[in-house]
Interface confidence: medium
Amino acid sequence: EEELQVIQPEKSVSVAAGDSATLNCTVSSLIPVGPIQWFRGAGPGRELIYNLKEGHFPRVTAVSDPTKRNNMDFSIRISNITPADAGTYYCVKFRKGSPDVELKSGAGTELSVRAKPS
């Protein structure tokens, strides 16, 4: 059985303050069943950015329909970027359970925020 891969193709993305940022993430397999979550930062201090299953994430939208059968694209778009959004974002696959168990993280995409040109 091929090992699940979580692929974040861009190592870095640069966006002007006020614009939207797209962070790409795909998985190599639909198995095992379980959600994808996005975090900013790693370790215990990481910040939950997007969780399809529950919560309210008003500035974040899924690029593809994550509820569609056989969807393997879990890219997100973050709107109205500010300097405080800068950091490294990780796409993380969980195995469904009670609670869900973290399986694999993508390599991360560093988001840098440029001053908006005046």
Partner: antibody, heavy 119, light 108 residues
Framework: DVQLVESGGGVVRPGESLRLSCAAS????????MNWVRQAPGEGLEWVSR????????DYAESVKGRFTISRDNSENTLYLQMNSLRAEDTAVYYC????????????WGLGALVTVSS | ETVLTQSPATLSVSPGERATLSCRAS??????LAWHQQKPGQAPRLLIY???NRATGIPDRFSGSGSGTDFTLTISSLQTEDSAVYYC??????????FGGGTKVEIK
């Protein structure tokens, strides 16, 4: 409906400790960063501390750093503020405030808990 | 650190008249500015976020404008229940989160 209810306030002497709690309901507590904001008598609002949704990331105002500790129990939907080495200038109403998203404004506030530090 | 300066400190307005409150940031905060209302003896309540968006349940007599460093909260037709202190809050740079010093709105 979102509800935030603080408890644990009271009167203490300088140098003593107190722990505030904030019971949250009506939203997905584990998905939101939470904050403590205080207001000294007759004064404006002062941000005190923030904790991220998972509980592992914390920030503090310089005025409380090293004395106050913010924590949360996502299984109990409760936010805490452990206040040590209290000073007279910590006297205030302490509000817990829900953050709209990880990098956002405070969209709901608790009713507040009064902490009085006096000898 | 971004400093928010609110003016005037106190505003006395007759019922039905317009009230205009100002909040100025020491550096740009984009559109990341909120306004909170605090009535005497009560907790703050969110009125406006992202400079111009009214929070849920807020009457349309409240409106926000501005971006960058200069922001305005307007109460188009003041009601007696609008007597309160109004605070602006920036969330463009943090920590720390910063609030303005407040504007007290009194009914004439």
């Amino acid at each position: 409906d979102v509800q935030l209810v603080e408890s644990g306030g009271g009167v203490v002497r300088p140098g003593e400790s107190l722990r505030l709690s904030c019971a949250a309901s009506g939203f997905s507590f584990s998905s939101h960063a939470m904050n403590w904001v205080r207001q000294a008598p007759g004064e404006g609002l002062e941000w005190v501390s923030r904790i991220n949704s998972g509980g592992g990331g914390t920030d503090y105002a310089e005025s409380v750093k090293g004395r106050f500790t913010i924590s949360r129990d996502n299984s109990e939907n409760t936010l805490y503020l452990q206040m040590n080495s209290l000073r007279a200038e910590d006297t205030a109403v302490y509000y817990c405030a829900k953050q709209y998203d990880w990098n956002g404004f405070f969209d709901y506030w608790g009713l507040g808990a009064l902490v009085t530090v006096s000898s | 650190e971004t400093v928010l300066t609110q003016s005037p400190a106190t505003l006395s307005v007759s019922p039905g008249e317009r009230a205009t409150l100002s909040c100025r940031a020491s550096q740009t905060v984009g559109s990341k500015l909120a306004w909170h209302q605090q009535k005497p003896g009560q907790a703050p309540r969110l009125l406006i976020y992202d400079a111009t968006n009214r929070a849920t349940g807020i009457p349309d007599r409240f409106s926000g404008s501005g971006s960058g460093t200069d922001f305005t909260l307007t109460i188009s037709s003041l009601q007696t229940e609008d007597s309160a202190v109004y605070y602006c809050q920036q969330y463009y740079y943090w920590p720390p989160y910063r609030f303005g010093g407040g504007t007290k709105v009194e009914i004439k």
